[in-house]
């Protein structure tokens, strides 16, 4: 018996087609992805093949103005239109709190939404009961397939799930649910979830009875043969893991942003054992037409976005200096504003010992692309912020050793004075440079804001200590020459859309007046 699994993950609000790098579509003839194009491809496969499942491994939420405005209603609407068979909850599905998941998505979705390792307690338990499930048994042709969901246990540090959801260890939580499916005579089981490729592989290895793992979170691109676009494969598709009980378990993921549709063919024997598996992600390029009806629906929904772009988010009573003459040479108040917003967006009261789990931010000055003039009645709009942060990136959470941070700050000024983009703006950091010293030895003082303290204060950076830092995904990926970050990071979790982070902060503060306050000094 053959099953075709179509899968997406980490779509992050890319409802419209995008450029090859998943940013805003500029040249339509070269654009990719989007729900209208995905619809066409899915329908083509559904009418050509007998047993097809369309699955999503989480993080539909967050990433473009679509989410900012529609807050998840767009996800439910267009996923319903695509007739998804199941979805696993990702960490970003909790970005607007539990209510922001329940109302727009859980109550509106016409497909099951799954996670076996999220347990509700207190008053939330009855409110959310039945709206998401640990697993679902789906009829496919003449057979049944069990889908069991899972979500990153780091979600409380990455999003806003509140205090009434407990995120258990994925493997511990999955095993009893899979066992339950086995007692229900379900012998074909897919683990669908959002914890990253390393955890996906562990699930394949450790959870007895899981036949296939469909994952997300790490934006992993797998491919067999010559890849069709710019993404470099992290391994073959599917990636085969040998389980502890000796089975070959295919593990798949389909990069991110709706650029590809994962396509996996699985052959099962009559006892539900995987005999063979093969496939590849399908690049959703412009050779695949966008479905005209879905496209028309997208255009109808778009109108509200265009209106939103020009509405006032808040006011500034000072000039927001985002000029390259400032932000690439010295501390600039636009950099301070953005870093303060990044930290504010990551406030999660972890426990009594920590006032927050992260206190530090770094931001390449070259990523700040425009100032905002306060003389326009002080008004700040989404449109204004899009000029400051035009690249559609995310502000991510990483863990780095102190020694890596020191290297990053040395890189920040290794060729100072040439108006290059690697000069770092900061938050929760005090740095002093001596430019008279040779490159690689110019950081003379580097103090960082404590997190394990009731009254935050600045302490000298410790080389061997592990620190959490918020930074643009561009830096996490080694951009602007920050190869040491990419090579030495110990953990990387993708965060929220950059503009959204700053716009939310401005809306929250209502009136802003960021200063230049001595975060960066030259001796």
């Amino acid at each position: 018996w053959e099953l075709t699994i179509l899968h997406t993950n980490d779509v992050h609000s890319r409802l419209e087609q995008t450029s090859e790098d998943s940013s805003k579509c500029v040249n339509a003839s070269r654009c990719m992805g989007g729900v209208a194009r995905l619809f066409t491809k899915v329908q083509q496969i559904r009418r050509a093949e007998p047993n097809v499942l369309l699955l999503d491994a989480g993080d539909q939420y967050q990433g473009t103005i679509w989410f900012t405005v529609y807050k998840g209603a767009e996800v439910a609407h267009f996923m319903n239109a695509l007739r998804y068979d199941a979805m696993a909850l990702g960490n970003h599905e909790f970005d607007n709190g539990v209510e922001g998941l329940i109302e727009p998505l859980l109550k509106e979705a016409k497909f099951p939404i799954l996670s076996a390792n999220i347990k509700a307690k207190g008053p939330l338990a009855s409110q959310i009961s039945g709206l998401y499930l640990p697993y679902k048994v789906l009829p496919v042709g003449d057979e049944v397939v069990g889908i069991v969901g899972y979500t990153s246990k780091e979600t409380p540090f990455l999003s806003n799930p509140g205090t009434n959801l407990v995120f258990e260890d994925e493997i511990t939580a999955l095993q009893p649910e899979v066992d339950k499916l086995k007692t229900l005579n379900v012998n074909k089981i897919i683990a669908l979830g959002h914890s990253g490729f390393e955890t996906d592989k562990l699930i394949a290895q450790k959870v007895r009875g899981v036949d296939v793992v469909v994952g997300g979170h790490s934006n992993t691109f797998l491919y067999t043969g010559n890849p069709p676009s710019k993404e470099v494969p992290a391994g073959k598709y599917p990636f085969i893991v040998t389980s502890d009980d000796g089975r070959k378990v295919p593990v798949v993921q389909a990069y991110a942003f709706g650029k590809y549709l994962g396509y996996l063919k699985i052959e099962f024997d009559e006892r539900g054992n995987v005999i063979s598996s093969h496939g590849n992600p399908i690049l959703l390029n412009s050779s695949i037409p966008e479905d005209p009806s879905i496209k028309a629906d997208i255009n109808k929904w778009r109108i509200k976005l265009d209106n939103y772009s020009t509405q006032e988010l808040g006011k500034t009573i000072v000039y927001l200096d985002g000029s390259s003459q400032s932000c690439r040479f010295r501390e600039c108040n636009m950099g301070n504003l953005i870093c303060d917003a990044m930290i504010n967006n990551n406030l999660r009261h972890a426990d009594e010992m920590f006032w927050n789990h992260v206190s530090m931010c770094i931001l390449n000055g070259g990523g700040i692309r425009s100032p905002i003039d306060e003389r326009n009645n002080g008004t700040i709009t989404w449109e204004n912020l899009a000029a400051v942060l035009p690249f559609g990136g995310t502000f991510d959470l990483v863990q780095l050793k102190g020694s890596t941070l020191k290297k990053a700050f040395e890189h920040s000024v290794h060729r100072y004075g040439q108006s290059t983009g690697e000069f770092l703006q900061v938050g929760g950091i005090h740095v002093v440079y001596d430019l008279s010293r040779k490159p690689g030895d110019r950081v003379v003082k580097l103090d960082v804001l404590c997190t394990k303290c009731r009254v935050p204060s600045y302490d000298p950076l410790k080389m061997d200590e592990i620190y959490k830092v918020i930074l643009p995904n561009f830096l996490a990926n080694g951009g602007d020459g920050f190869q040491m970050i990419k090579d030495e990071l110990l953990r990387h979790d993708s965060g929220d859309q950059d503009i959204n982070v700053v716009s939310t902060y401005i809306s929250k503060m209502k009136v802003i007046y960021p200063a230049v306050e001595g975060r960066i000094k030259f001796s």
Partner: antibody, heavy 117, light 113 residues
Framework: EVQLQQSGPELVKPGASVKISCKAS????????MNWVKQSHGKSLEWIGN????????NYNQKFKGKATLTVDKSSSTASMELRSLTSEDSAVYYC??????????WGQGTTLTVSS | DIVMTQSPSSLTVTAGEKVTMSCKSS????????????LTWYQQKPGQPPKVLIY???TRESGVPDRFTGSGSGTDFTLTISSVQAEDLAVYYC?????????FGGGTNLEIK
């Protein structure tokens, strides 16, 4: 211009096998499934099966399982169908047709198969 | 599998007349996602392969004369030729293009007096 050029008519004896080919041109061969359709004399159209030229995966109408085998040669953009254990019931016109995104877009000109002793 | 039933099986008309033929499916062909009915009408002239006339139940393929109109939704569909021409002599087939496997109706043979 998209074209599907099928091989010529076949006259074969009962019990034998035959292989019909369909050479595609004018489009990216791997973009669309290739279908095969049977039309007996004066009768309607019957879908035999399809093949995904990307990976050679096949899907068959239950009725034609064991009768037809579909293959592709990507290097020459050619799809083929082998029919075995032929009987007079297999006498028909056979079409290849690629299924684009909305329907069976392009059809070959048809290959007439006559099974007779 | 979805069963497609066409009627009448044959039809003889005079040039210039209006013709309607019916196609019924055993299950709905409406895709709730894009609100399209995945029904295709083909025309097959003698000695030729079938050619698409109408897709999505009512969308005319480019180059098809506007005398051909498709209508209907769900399970009941109609092909209308507003003023039959001599060159319309053919067999007309409907096809389920919604779900696997694709299935064809038995055809309506249109003859011209």
């Amino acid at each position: 211009e998209v074209q599907l050029q099928q091989s010529g008519p076949e006259l074969v004896k009962p019990g034998a096998s035959v292989k019909i080919s369909c050479k595609a041109s004018g489009y990216t061969f791997t973009d669309y499934y290739m279908n095969w359709v049977k039309q007996s004399h004066g009768k309607s159209l019957e879908w035999i099966g399809n093949i995904n030229p990307n990976n050679g995966d096949t899907n068959y109408n239950q009725k034609f399982k064991g009768k037809a085998t579909l293959t592709v040669d990507k290097s020459s953009s050619t799809a083929s169908m082998e029919l075995r254990s032929l009987t007079s019931e297999d006498s028909a016109v056979y079409y290849c047709a690629n299924s684009g995104y909305y329907y069976f877009d392009y059809w070959g000109q048809g290959t007439t198969l006559t099974v007779s002793s | 599998d979805i069963v497609m039933t066409q009627s009448p099986s044959s039809l003889t008309v005079t040039a210039g007349e209006k013709v309607t033929m019916s196609c019924k499916s055993s299950q709905s062909l409406l895709n709730s996602g894009n609100q399209k009915n995945y029904l295709t009408w083909y025309q097959q002239k003698p000695g030729q392969p079938p050619k698409v006339l109408i897709y999505w139940a009512s969308t005319r393929e480019s180059g098809v004369p506007d005398r051909f109109t498709g209508s209907g939704s769900g399970t009941d569909f109609t092909l209308t030729i507003s003023s039959v021409q001599a060159e319309d002599l053919a067999v007309y087939y409907c096809q389920n293009d919604y779900s696997y496997p694709p299935t064809f109706g038995g055809g309506t043979n249109l003859e011209i007096k």
